[in-house]
């Protein structure tokens, strides 16, 4: 399984249909500014085995996704965009999906880091709670897309790792 | 390793233009602003503009906007700082620094060594 | 725009000694605010960042407090290489602004 090659070149496409999202220029929204407190630990590690590293990385591009089919969220963004954006992100959850049940067999480990997993949930569930405060306002959702470009690249180096691990 | 690079010290004369750069490495060039601050001999640090280099959109102090042009070329990860006709009042050390846009991160944490600008007749 | 006013302008200390700065905004700022070091000849360097956050690489004795319009920069221990001057910046809102200075000369 060639998940980081791939799965690399998915982030990268999603990197860009982000960027090209921003509706308001993100000047006006300084004093929006929030710390999410990005669950870098989880990411930091080298004690993970692959299919777990697969399901911690899966766990963000499913609430990422999350984020992005929400109702609140459509009335925000380009429709053809955010409909690139989530196809994007489907196809890696489907291609992560395949490679962790390859791994199966390999591993003797548990398929699941359960800590790390909470970790990235309780992250979104940051990020949801601080757009409800907000009540969705532009500002906050150009926040909180500059917030996930941030994670998808330093998670963008995780992926990097684990490839050179192999 | 973060760096900032700027050009070298310019000496013009009154009405001449100047194009100053500053030149990011170490890090992903469009992922951060690029602000630009002028301090004037014996004063103190003054905020000039910022640009996002992933588009190119631009934001001006007052105090500034229409005496400068901020641009940039995220192709060789470069912000330019310019002026179309120089006045003495220009003469200022001119220093880019690195900023993190919405991101939950410090403000202005690496800085350039800064372009010395002498305009003189 | 958001002035920003640093005091005292100057100040003499004795390494060893502690060492207070304040920064007053005219307005609420919250804790977007942030403080550089400056050393003749040199760019400026952050110290601290969002009020209280100690950059990486900056030694423990510079610490920061304050919220809404006040706020600190104290130098617990001043060393030799602390002498130099200091700003505080407000970050919440464009134009961006930077206090007046403070300059930390040796008695």
């Known amino acids: 399984c060639d998940l980081p090659q791939t799965h690399s070149l998915g982030n990268r496409r999603a990197l860009i249909l982000l960027a090209q999202m921003g509706r308001i220029s993100p000047f006006s929204c300084l004093k929006d500014r929030h710390d999410f407190g990005f669950p870098q630990e989880e990411f930091d590690g080298n004690q993970f085995q692959k299919a777990q590293a697969i399901s911690v990385l899966h766990e963000m591009i499913q609430q990422t996704f999350n984020l992005f089919s929400t109702k609140d969220s459509s009335a925000t963004w380009e429709q053809s965009l955010l409909e690139k954006f989530s196809t994007e992100l489907n196809q890696q959850l489907n291609d992560m999906e395949a490679c962790v049940i390859q791994e199966v067999g390999v591993e003797e480990t548990p398929l699941m880091n359960v800590d790390s997993i909470l970790a990235v949930k309780k992250y979104f569930q940051r990020i949801t709670l601080y757009l409800t405060e907000k009540k969705y306002s532009p500002c906050a959702w150009e926040v909180v897309r500059a917030e996930i470009m941030r994670s998808f690249s330093l998670s963008k180096i995780f992926q990097e790792r684990l490839r050179r691990k192999e | 390793e973060v760096q900032l690079v700027q050009s070298g010290a310019e000496v013009k004369k009154p009405g001449e233009s100047l194009k100053i750069s500053c030149k990011g490495s170490?890090?992903?060039?469009?992922?951060?602003?690029i602000g630009w601050v002028r301090q004037m001999p014996g004063k103190g640090l003054e905020w000039m503009g910022i640009?996002?280099?992933?588009?190119?959109?631009?934001a001006y102090s007052p105090s500034f906007q229409g005496q400068v042009t901020i641009s940039a070329d995220k192709s060789i990860s470069t912000a330019y700082l310019q002026w179309s006709s120089l006045k003495a009042s220009d003469t200022a050390m001119y220093y880019c620094?690195?900023?993190?846009?919405?991101?939950?991160?410090?403000?202005?944490?690496?800085w350039g060594q800064g372009t010395l600008v002498t305009v003189s007749s | 725009d958001i002035q920003m006013t640093q005091s005292p302008s100057s100040l003499s200390a004795s390494v060893g000694d502690r060492v207070t700065i304040t920064c007053r905004a005219s307005?609420?700022?919250?804790?977007?605010l942030n403080w550089y070091q400056q050393k003749p000849g040199k760019a400026p360097k952050l110290l601290i960042y969002?009020?209280?956050s100690l950059q990486s690489g900056v030694p423990s004795r510079f610490s920061g407090s304050g919220s809404g319009t006040d706020f600190t920069l104290t130098i617990s221990s001043l060393q030799p290489e602390d002498f130099a001057t200091y700003y505080c910046?407000?970050?919440?809102?464009?134009?961006?602004?930077f206090g007046q200075g403070t300059k930390v000369e040796i008695k």
């Open positions: 969002f009020a209280s």
């Open positions: 640009i996002d280099p992933s588009d190119s959109d631009t």
């Open positions: 170490g890090y992903s060039f469009t992922s951060y602003w």
């Open positions: 910046q407000q970050s919440i809102d464009f134009p961006l602004t």
């Open positions: 620094a690195r900023h993190p846009g919405l991101n939950w991160a410090p403000d202005f944490d690496y």
């Open positions: 307005q609420s700022i919250a804790e977007f």
